[in-house]
């Protein structure tokens, strides 16, 4: 069976993991979304998508 991570679906350095129901993107700090496409904007943040100090990595997001 083809590797669902072969197409590199996770953006911004997110790590891809094959899963029985599809795949999972574990987002790098400062990103969120199914494919880590959204920069996290904490309240008061500037337009820069950099992660503020202490922001933990995003929870893995399902991508089905």
């Amino acid at each position: 069976r083809a590797d669902p991570c072969a197409a590199r679906p996770c953006a911004h350095g997110g790590r891809c993991y094959a899963h029985f129901s599809g795949l999972v993107c574990a987002c790098a700090p400062g990103y969120m979304g199914a494919r880590c496409e959204f920069p996290v904007h904490p309240d008061g943040a500037s337009a820069l998508p950099a992660a503020p100090p202490g922001l933990r990595p995003g929870d893995p997001q399902r991508y089905l």
């Epitope: 969120m32 979304g33 920069p39 929870d59």
Partner: antibody
């Protein structure tokens, strides 16, 4: 029944703030992202941002950065969108919408009824 | 930002007509595209996601196709309840963006 119910219409003066609520029911609140989309009179749809109700993380469209805040209350399954420093061009219908299956890939499958915000002096 | 261009912006058709609406993306978005229907005074309704997958409960006369930069929404036989405005939306990258809309009116 899966639904999103929004707060009522608001009339605000320029410079003021507005806070719109969106109460979810009929599904597990923390499993699905919530988007906010607005529509000015006679105009198209404009994406404002997204909130992950599970962790409270947010991502806002660039044009709203610094002026919008999206929050959630998991105890009441409610999401809030506050827009500050209102101007006349913020007059619009504001919608909350659910991102399908905890992601945004599937589009926005459930929408609130909309909240009309009128900004006028 | 990815710009979504819909055409036509206005379409006059009769009941029973086959209607096609086109949406073009300013850069490739794979199949990350959704179509919505909106009637006056109402919230949009999701019709199609992933470019070609019909949302549950949507009549089979609606279909979507395309990948990359060019997409189409087709209504095989227009019904009275289909007169509305249709929007495409790209879900490929931040920020999410919509097309300008296509208003389908009765001829």
């Amino acid at each position: 029944e899966v639904q999103l119910v929004q707060s009522g219409a608001e009339v605000k003066k320029p410079g003021a703030s507005v806070k719109v609520s969106c109460k979810a029911s009929g599904y597990t609140f923390t499993t699905y992202y919530i988007h906010w989309v607005r529509q000015a009179p006679g105009q198209g749809l404009e994406w404002m941002g997204i909130i992950d109700p599970s962790g409270g993380r947010t991502s806002y469209a660039q044009k709203f950065l610094g002026r919008v805040t999206m929050t959630r209350d998991t105890s009441t399954s409610t999401v809030y969108m506050e827009l500050r420093s209102l101007r006349s061009e913020d007059t619009a219908v504001y919608y909350c919408a659910r991102g399908g299956d905890g992601t945004w890939y599937y589009g926005m499958d459930v929408w609130g009824q909309g909240t009309t915000v009128t900004v006028s002096s | 930002d990815i710009v979504m261009t819909q055409s036509p912006s206005f379409l006059s058709a009769s009941v029973g007509d086959r209607v096609t609406i086109t949406c073009r993306a300013s850069q490739g978005i794979s199949n990350y595209l959704a179509w919505y229907q909106q009637k006056p005074g109402k919230a949009p309704k999701l019709l199609i996601y992933a470019a070609s997958t019909l949302q549950s409960g949507v009549p089979s006369r609606f279909s979507g196709s395309g990948s990359g930069t060019e997409f189409t929404l087709t209504i095989s036989s227009l019904q009275p309840e289909d007169f509305a405005t249709y929007y495409c939306q790209q879900l490929n990258s931040y920020p999410l963006t919509f097309g300008g809309g296509t208003k389908v009116e009765i001829k």
